[in-house]
Amino acid sequence: QRFAQAQQQLPLESLGWDVAELQLNHTGPQQDPRLYWQGGPALGRSFLHGPELDKGQLRIHRDGIYMVHIQVTLAICSSTTASRHHPTTLAVGICSPASRSISLLRLSFHQGCTIASQRLTPLARGDTLCTNLTGTLLPSRNTDETFFGVQWVRP
Amino acid sequence: QRFAQAQQQLPLESLGWDVAELQLNHTGPQQDPRLYWQGGPALGRSFLHGPELDKGQLRIHRDGIYMVHIQVTLAICSSTTASRHHPTTLAVGICSPASRSISLLRLSFHQGCTIASQRLTPLARGDTLCTNLTGTLLPSRNTDETFFGVQWVRP
Amino acid sequence: QRFAQAQQQLPLESLGWDVAELQLNHTGPQQDPRLYWQGGPALGRSFLHGPELDKGQLRIHRDGIYMVHIQVTLAICSSTTASRHHPTTLAVGICSPASRSISLLRLSFHQGCTIASQRLTPLARGDTLCTNLTGTLLPSRNTDETFFGVQWVRP
């Protein structure tokens, strides 16, 4: 059970409640498949409590098991568009440090225009998560269609 | 880490463990795109611990960041059905109070018969979440195919 | 809020932080639609903290409400393949004890090659979860494409 606030003097961040929800800022230049994210109350309903953004990529500040989730919708897309521009693929992975580089979650769009998934994965302080969108279609920047987040679950 | 039960005298609800998982009750009349939900152990595996239902819509009782998730499957659907009657779209949003009205999560079915997604979002006590299904296909009422839930994650 | 580590002497498992993330080991023989899972740090990023594997199926060790999530990608799949071999369906359910047998989550692939979803559901100590993949297509064993996990959320 979560600790009663009355008994809790420490700031939330010290308790391992790291959480972030990001919205798309922009895509990278042509040879860079990464999506660049942004977050903060001034932008709408995105936020970072613990993790930080490093040049649009999410950096983890606390070791633990995290729930990572993502939804990406392709812009001006129909099932015909999606199939014609196949393959469009999204991969979420640890991109730095290089020694820990690994793909965590991968999905192809096939004849759909949206992918959404989630998974539990161990992450360490300093891990940077990158989201790579390969293909020639642009992601929607609508905040209810494209988002990316993490939630600390346990040590 | 969650607080050891031995040291915890307060009821769970006072600790911010609000959670709900709902099953579809019915669709609205023709001009009302909202889905109407129901929950409770008598109905199967749905439940409400904290949030409440207000005329089939989910009302939040505790401020915080929530994980919102949903799956909707269309009834008697094949990829042909889904594509022929495009666009069928699901949107989850805050529908009241009107001052906080916003779309939180939106997906189109395109050539698929199921959408499923999840996101983290701040919600406040009194926020009512509505799930709007636009289009002319009916959602499945099977409890393993269509469901909607929230989980309080942190203040 | 989660209890500060400094004040927490009990092992994590005693606090109800059960969590597991599994990767596909193998499919069953022809008449057995179940997927067989494996987990542990030696295998990569999969793990079991609390729940256990029983002949490749996930057994719950603590009563509570759990978030169950899954992603399955079909091997060597295109939208044409997927539609031609329709229906391919994935169902996650309690398969034992028999008295509690129920389908919790069900998705069809239609013209897609990946399904991903999640839901909250009450589970009891001793419940074994089975994931049934019906159809003639094989699931990918790539750890970023096919995975299955549970997270204890509250009592």
Partner: antibody, heavy 120, light 111 residues
Framework: QVQLVQSGAEVKKPGASVKVSCKVS????????LHWVRQAPGKGLEWMGV????????DYNQKFKGRVTMTEDTSTDTAYMELSSLRSEDTAVYYC?????????????WGQGTLVTVSA | DIVLTQSPASLAVSPGQRATITCRAS??????????LHWYQQKPGQPPKLLIY???NLESGVPARFSGSGSGTDFTLTINPVEAEDTANYYC?????????FGGGTKVEIK
Amino acid sequence: QVQLVQSGAEVKKPGASVKVSCKVSGYTFTDSALHWVRQAPGKGLEWMGVISTYDGDTDYNQKFKGRVTMTEDTSTDTAYMELSSLRSEDTAVYYCARRGYYDYDWFPYWGQGTLVTVSA
Amino acid sequence: DIVLTQSPASLAVSPGQRATITCRASKSVSASGYSFLHWYQQKPGQPPKLLIYLASNLESGVPARFSGSGSGTDFTLTINPVEAEDTANYYCQHSRELPPTFGGGTKVEIK
């Protein structure tokens, strides 16, 4: 309000073809599929097929495949059903019908019917 | 194709009484939590009129004395109380799959 108005009665010889029209009003023609149902004198109702007015896609009852052709003309909001190689047992009232709001095949809206008599 | 069998073939009922018509499907017409079975009334020289859709939903403008029930393969249309204007043929129809089919009809007469 939704209206479906069909063409007038026809008398045809065996082996001939008949083409029945169904002009719709009160809604956007391409929004909803149109079905054709027939009823022989004193008999029950028999579904013949459906045309998607959105893209012209058709599904026919196996019984009529090869003899029935359903088409649409979006410029005049009109659907057509043509039945060829007529025989005496094709004598019936032919109805066009439209589904309601939902895309499932039950029919709140019907044309008035067109009597087709097949007689030598 | 799914075969729908209606019974009785004909029925004579006194005004104010209850009329019950059954429709049995050769296989289940229920799916996704709905029963895709519908009821129509047809008077001589007129097209059919939708009364009930999805087994139990009353079509707009239809009097509340008409009701439907059932699931799976067995369905019932009830008229209670019957009125003189209810003299007509009644048909069930499924839309569970293509082709949709109709029952053979039940002729209701008022005594």
